[in-house]
């Protein structure tokens, strides 16, 4: 059976939008007006994952691109990357763990915890135009809260 997916955009809690920065990186910056069209549209897929009270397992693909956010070790550090996949096989219900994020939602604020690396979160910097990354701290300088906006399919 096909996995269920919804199209959306994400903004961090400072209202920075996410845009492509080269072929395999996202960056966060404030956009306005016409420039909002630059923001990436995600296809959020609801996938299988470990049972947990307040966590919903999702995969985050880039709409109509065969790219998914994934979490891997690079130089012994959990790292966020955009990974190319075979579009014939993705998305699927049982995504490999590196593609799975636990969506934690409180009062319409979303966090995305790596399933592969617990307590590591999709993060943005306070500074403008910096890469989206996987951060190991919550509630510090870096931003781990996002809002989601639906996009028509």
């Amino acid at each position: 059976a096909p996995v269920r997916s919804l199209n959306c955009t994400l903004r961090d809690s400072q209202q920075k939008s996410l845009v492509m920065s080269g072929p395999y990186e996202l960056k966060a910056l404030h956009l306005q007006g016409q420039d909002m069209e630059q923001q990436v549209v995600f296809s959020m897929s609801f996938v299988q994952g470990e049972e947990s009270n307040d966590k919903i397992p999702v995969a985050l693909g880039l709409k109509e691109k065969n790219l998914y956010l994934s979490c891997v070790l690079k130089d012994d550090k959990p790292t966020l990357q955009l990974e190319s996949v075979d579009p014939k096989n993705y998305p699927k219900k049982k995504m490999e763990k590196r593609f799975v994020f636990n969506k934690i939602e409180i009062n319409n604020k979303l966090e995305f915890e790596s399933a592969q690396f617990p307590n590591w979160y999709i993060s943005t910097s306070q500074a403008e135009n910096m890469p989206v990354f996987l951060g190991g701290t919550k509630g510090g300088q870096d931003i781990t809260d996002f809002t989601m906006q639906f996009v028509s399919s």
């Epitope: 919804l6 299988q48 399919s153």
Partner: antibody
Framework: QVQLVQSGAEVKKPGSSVKVSCKAS????????IEWVRQAPGQGLEWMGE????????NYNEKFKGRVTITADKSTSTAYMELSSLRSEDTAVYYC?????????????WGQGTLVTVSS | DIQMTQSPSSLSASVGDRVTITCKAS??????LSWFQQKPKAPKSLIYR??RLVDGVPSRFSGSGSGTDFTLTISSLQPEDFATYYC?????????FGGGTKVEIK
């Protein structure tokens, strides 16, 4: 308070159409699927389709495709289910229900139901 | 379509009894199963994601299971619990319902 209030009972002739409404209140309409389910007298429950008002995404039960149209009006927080080419076997209670956009909470809230009677 | 086989179709029980209703799916439905209660008025949701209790539902109701086999338990039946209970899977389109279990007074 959080509720779904459906339109009143309808009596329809075979071949005609019926449009049932479901008005949501007390929650963010955009973020929940509105599900449509029916129950014919003495029969089981049958899922007809769903709409996510925030995105406009719609999923239909293949069994009803072509006969059912589900819409939503965000300005009034109201969802609609229209069933055409009615036949006697469409006589049923039609329910709306809500489900969070990420499918986590299941059919978490139900409307009171709308009885549609198809009779010549 | 996924078949949801619910049993028993009816049962008679007394106030204070422990009641168990089962639902078997024709294939794995992951965590996407809920239970609801139907009386003459609007259906009322009881359990979602197999075992999570809906806010405001008494703790005498509980859900368990995984994969294809699921159970709704009422630990101590109360007078207001006499009703019909349904399971529903929402893992795959079309969503499908069990046939219902009518809980009657013995």
């Amino acid at each position: 308070q959080v509720q779904l209030v459906q339109s009143g009972a309808e009596v329809k002739k075979p071949g005609s159409s019926v449009k049932v409404s479901c008005k949501a209140s007390g929650y963010t309409f955009d973020r929940y699927w509105i599900e449509w389910v029916r129950q014919a007298p003495g029969q089981g429950l049958e899922w007809m389709g769903e709409i996510l008002p925030g995105s406009g995404d719609i999923n239909y039960n293949e069994k009803f495709k072509g006969r059912v149209t589900i819409t939503a009006d965000k300005s009034t927080s109201t969802a609609y289910m229209e069933l055409s080419s009615l036949r006697s076997e469409d006589t049923a209670v039609y329910y709306c229900a809500r489900m969070y956009y990420d499918y986590d909470q299941g059919f978490s809230l139900w409307g009171q139901g709308t009885l549609v009677t198809v009779s010549s | 379509d996924i078949q949801m086989t619910q049993s028993p179709s009816s049962l008679s029980a007394s106030v204070g009894d422990r009641v168990t209703i089962t639902c078997k799916a024709s294939q794995d439905i992951d965590r996407f199963l809920s239970w609801f209660q139907q009386k003459p008025k609007a259906p009322k949701s009881l359990i979602y994601r197999v075992k999570r209790l809906v806010d405001g539902v008494p703790s005498r109701f509980s859900g368990s299971g995984s994969g294809t086999d699921f159970t709704l338990t009422i630990s101590s039946l109360q007078p207001e619990d006499f009703a019909t209970y349904y399971c529903v899977q929402y893992d795959e389109f079309p969503y499908t319902f069990g046939g219902g279990t009518k809980v009657e007074i013995k």
